[in-house]
């Protein structure tokens, strides 16, 4: 209806383009823009009971642009979609929906999980840890000498933190019993801590503080690697007992 009025208006005004606002190529006093300059989108804006044409450099949120030889127009995205490239390719879903491959879903497909921050369906990410670093020197109360039963530890880093549905991380540090090297402490060594004496320089960007404590990870799901570790630890305990027997005579 408005468009036909606009056409009548055009017949009454031969110079419809004169005095057009902004990006309008042709316009009328009553209907506003009738057509737009290149690379601009034509959209209808409701003002009270009246719809007027406007020319926009991009379509408003919730609309997408479609090109035709004579006009570029804005069309509404699907009802569940906030921003889109077209009706079939949503780029941001309305609240309560998850985006997956351009579609808005109530629930994510199997094998994917909902990211409630980005409101997307994302791949499940499992924990990844590095190889174990070498065992630390064997120490007892910080000393690396004195024929005592001590402990040694080793650590590994978390390379990839798991997502909500991913496998939790296995422990990132391990401690085992050991025998401090067979030599008497020298005077100067007595108070020196093995950690200070033999500490390797940490790699660039690596800090000891950043290594999570295994205690916080003890409750994690047991994964095959952990089972393996437990078996290894049992073996080690047996070996350690044998060691301690052979060492116990030297006191």
């Amino acid at each position: 209806q408005n468009a036909s009025r606009g056409r009548r208006q055009r017949r009454m005004h031969p110079n419809v383009s004169q005095g057009c606002q902004g990006g309008c190529a042709t316009c009328s006093d009553y209907n506003g823009c009738l057509s737009c300059k290149p690379r601009l989108f034509f959209a209808l804006e409701r003002i009270g009971m009246k719809q007027i044409g406007v020319c926009l450099s991009s379509c408003p949120s919730g609309y997408y642009g479609t090109r035709y030889p004579d006009i570029n127009k804005c069309t509404k995205c699907k009802a569940d979609c906030d921003t889109c490239f077209n009706k079939n390719f949503c780029t941001k879903c309305k609240s309560g929906f998850y985006l997956h491959l351009g579609k808005c879903l109530d629930n994510c497909p199997e094998g994917l999980e909902a990211n409630n921050h980005t409101m997307e369906c994302v791949s499940i990410v499992h924990c990844e840890v590095s190889e174990w670093n070498p065992w630390s020197p064997c120490t007892k109360k910080g000393k690396t000498c004195g024929f005592k039963r001590g402990t040694e530890t080793r650590v590994r880093e978390i390379i990839q933190h798991p997502s909500a549905k991913g496998n939790l991380c296995p422990p990132t540090n391990e401690t085992r019993k050991c025998t401090v090297q067979r030599k008497k402490c020298q005077k100067g060594e007595r108070g020196k801590k093995g950690r200070e004496r033999k500490r390797k320089k940490p790699n660039k960007g690596e800090s000891k503080e950043a290594i999570p404590d295994s205690k916080s990870l003890e409750s994690s799901k047991e994964i095959p690697e952990q089972r393996e570790n437990k078996q290894q630890q049992k073996k080690r305990k047996v070996q350690d007992k044998q060691k301690s027997v052979s060492v116990s005579t030297v006191h």
Epitope: F41, S58, G65, T66, R67, N86, F89
Partner: antibody, heavy 117, light 111 residues
Framework: QVQLVQSGAEVKKPGASVKVSCKAS????????FHWVRQAPGQGLEWIGY????????GYNQKFKNRVTMTRDTSTSTAYMELSRLRSEDTAVYYC??????????WGQGTTLTVSS | DIVLTQSPASLAVSLGQRATISCKAS??????????MNWYQQKPGQPPKLLIY???NLESGIPARFSGSGSGTDFTLNIHPVEEEDAATYYC?????????FGAGTKLELK
């Protein structure tokens, strides 16, 4: 007129990251989405993803999702594409392009990335 | 993903003759009466250049000897009459679904 000027050629080692820039001029930077497309030597075109310069929202081809990050700087009308954990298969020419009503109508000149040990 | 299969992979055409390139989509790229299929031309060392948008609409500044047709899953690019400067690789591209995809390309050579 619309112009997209990309950063120069890059040579990287496997495992490294690269950040390619695309500076736009001749139009309002926030009006159109920016897309990135790559082309391996003698191969076809492959879409990587997009960014809305107006709000920074981005979306990526699933194939690149865990390795690519797209950002923009509205003050300099520049879009960026960072690709991490590079492998030899990432050797390609990387193009930025403006997306106007479901087609790529303006393209950058391309940035050649070589990944080699 | 929507797979676009272009044929032939290459073709040689004499000056002034017609070149026809086909692009078949693994599923429809139409929605709400619009076909989300575009055609690009690429010459060595240059970025692609938009020729046809929405299956059949000629991009401004592109000569009228280029034309596009088709809907649903079958699309065609025609060049008639072929001129020397048309020697290039031509790609179809769909914008209907995520991820956006391209055909493998058709290389046009002049006889």
């Amino acid at each position: 007129q619309v112009q997209l000027v990309q950063s120069g050629a890059e040579v990287k080692k496997p495992g490294a990251s690269v950040k390619v820039s695309c500076k736009a001029s001749g139009y309002t930077f926030t009006s159109y989405t920016f897309h990135w497309v790559r082309q391996a030597p003698g191969q076809g075109l492959e879409w990587i993803g997009y960014i809305y310069p107006s709000n920074g929202d981005s979306g990526y081809n699933q194939k690149f999702k865990n390795r690519v990050t797209m950002t923009r700087d509205t003050s300099t009308s520049t879009a960026y594409m960072e690709l991490s954990r590079l492998r030899s298969e990432d050797t390609a020419v990387y193009y930025c392009a403006t997306y106007f009503a479901n087609n790529f109508d303006y393209w950058g000149q391309g940035t050649t990335l070589t990944v080699s040990s | 993903d929507i797979v676009l299969t272009q044929s032939p992979a290459s073709l040689a055409v004499s000056l002034g003759q017609r070149a026809t390139i086909s692009c078949k989509a693994s599923q429809s790229v139409d929605y709400d009466g619009d076909s989300y299929m575009n055609w690009y031309q690429q010459k060595p060392g240059q970025p692609p250049k938009l020729l046809i948008y929405a299956a059949s609409n000629l991009e401004s500044g592109i000569p009228a000897r280029f034309s596009g047709s088709g809907s649903g899953t079958d699309f065609t690019l025609n060049i008639h009459p072929v001129e020397e400067e048309d020697a290039a690789t031509y790609y179809c591209q769909q914008s209907n679904e995520d991820p956006l995809t391209f055909g493998a390309g058709t290389k046009l050579e002049l006889k």
